[in-house]
Amino acid sequence: VPRWRQQWSGPGTTKRFPETVLARCVKYTEIHPEMRHVDCQSVWDAFKGAFISKHPCNITEEDYQPLMKLGTQTVPCNKILLWSRIKDLAHQFTQVQRDMFTLEDTLLGYLADDLTWCGEFNTSKINYQSCPDWRKDCSNNPVSVFWKTVSRRFAEAACDVVHVMLNGSRSKIFDKNSTFGSVEVHNLQPEKVQTLEAWVIHGGREDSRDLCQDPTIKELESIISKRNIQFSCKNIYRPDKFLQCVKNPEDSSCTSEI
C-alpha cells in the first residue's frame, strides 16, 4: 500500500539535491583556497540535518545553526552587494569586480542558489514531489527559513557603504515584500553602515527617466533615513556598458554617464 504523502503547492526538491550540494561544496572549496579546510561531507550532513525528518512548515533558524557554524567565512564588510529581482546582473558584476560579494558568492549562498528542498515529518526521505509554497502553504519552510537566516546575517555583517542593485523595469523597483525589503534593509546596523547606495538598473535602451525619483525608491530612502543610515541613488542607464566599464575602466567611453 503506498504511503500517504502530503501534497504541497510548490515544486518538489531539486532532483539530485544531495549530489548537487556536495558537488557545489567541493567546487567552491577548490576555487576559494581560504575555504580548503571545509569538510564538505560535514557540510552536507549539517544541511540535511536542518530539514530531514522535520515537518516542512515548522523549520526554525536554529535548525540551520550547525550549518552556519561550518560556513564561517571572511567577507569584507565594506564590499557587500545586495540585490533585488536582478540576480543575474549582480552576479555578473561580482564576477568582474572580484573584491565585491553577493550572498551567492559566499559558500552558503553558493550551495543553495536556485535550489529547492524539503523533507517529511518522521521519515528520513527527501520530498521530490512537492514542497511548501511560501504564500499558499507556510512561510516557515526549509528554503524560506534558510534564505531569511543567511540574508539577515549577511546584512548584519555589512559596514561602511553598502550597495544594492534594483531592477528598474519592475513596477515596484523597491518591493517591501522582497528579501531585500523585508529582511536585509531592517538588519543593516546603523552603527556600522554609513550609507546605502542604490543602483537602479534600466531595462529599455531609450529609457532616460530618473528612476531614483520613483515613489518606491523614495519609500526606501524614508525607511533607511529613519534608521539613521544615509541614502544615495544612481541610475544605471546602460547595464551592458556598465559591465563593460567595470571590466575596462580606462576605456574612453567610460567617463560619460552609464
Partner: nanobody, 117 residues
Framework: EVQVLESGGGLVQPGGSLRLSCAAS????????MSWVRQAPGKGLEWVSG????????DYADSVKGRFTISRDNSKNTLYLQMNSLRVEDTAVYYC??????????RGQGTLVTVSS
C-alpha cells in the same frame, strides 16, 4: 567605527589554560552579539564561540565544547574567552568579532595562542 583589541594569547603547554580578552569600542557593545573565531596556520577561519548581547545565551563549536567558556562584561565593553585543557590543535590566531556569523570581517589584529610542549 567598530574597533576591537584582542589580548591574552601566548605560549602554553598542552592541558594548560589561557584567558583571552577583547576590548571593544565605537559601537553600543551591549546591543551586539559577539563571537570568537580563529585561524590556524595555513587553515581557514573557524568559528569558536558566540554570545548574545546580554550574555544570556552562549554557543560553542563542538571542538571546544566543555573546555572553553565565553563571557562578557558590558560595563567594561569587554569580551572574554576562558580556554582550559588546551590542545596542540587549538594553536591559532584568535579574533573577536561582532555578530554570530557565518560572515565575519574581523577588525582587530588578533592574539596568537600557541599550544606546544
Amino acid at each position: 567605527e567598530v574597533q576591537v583589541l584582542e589580548s591574552g594569547g601566548g605560549l602554553v603547554q598542552p592541558g594548560g589554560s589561557l584567558r583571552l580578552s577583547c576590548a571593544a569600542s565605537g559601537f553600543t557593545f551591549s546591543s551586539y552579539a559577539m563571537s570568537w573565531v580563529r585561524q590556524a596556520p595555513g587553515k581557514g577561519l573557524e568559528w569558536v564561540s558566540g554570545i548574545s548581547g546580554s550574555g544570556g545565551t552562549t554557543d560553542y563549536a563542538d571542538s571546544v565544547k566543555g573546555r572553553f567558556t565565553i563571557s562578557r562584561d558590558n560595563s567594561k565593553n569587554t569580551l572574554y574567552l576562558q580556554m582550559n585543557s588546551l590542545r596542540v590543535e587549538d594553536t591559532a590566531v584568535y579574533y573577536c568579532a561582532d555578530g554570530t556569523g557565518p560572515f565575519f570581517d574581523y577588525r582587530g589584529q588578533g592574539t596568537l595562542v600557541t599550544v606546544s610542549s
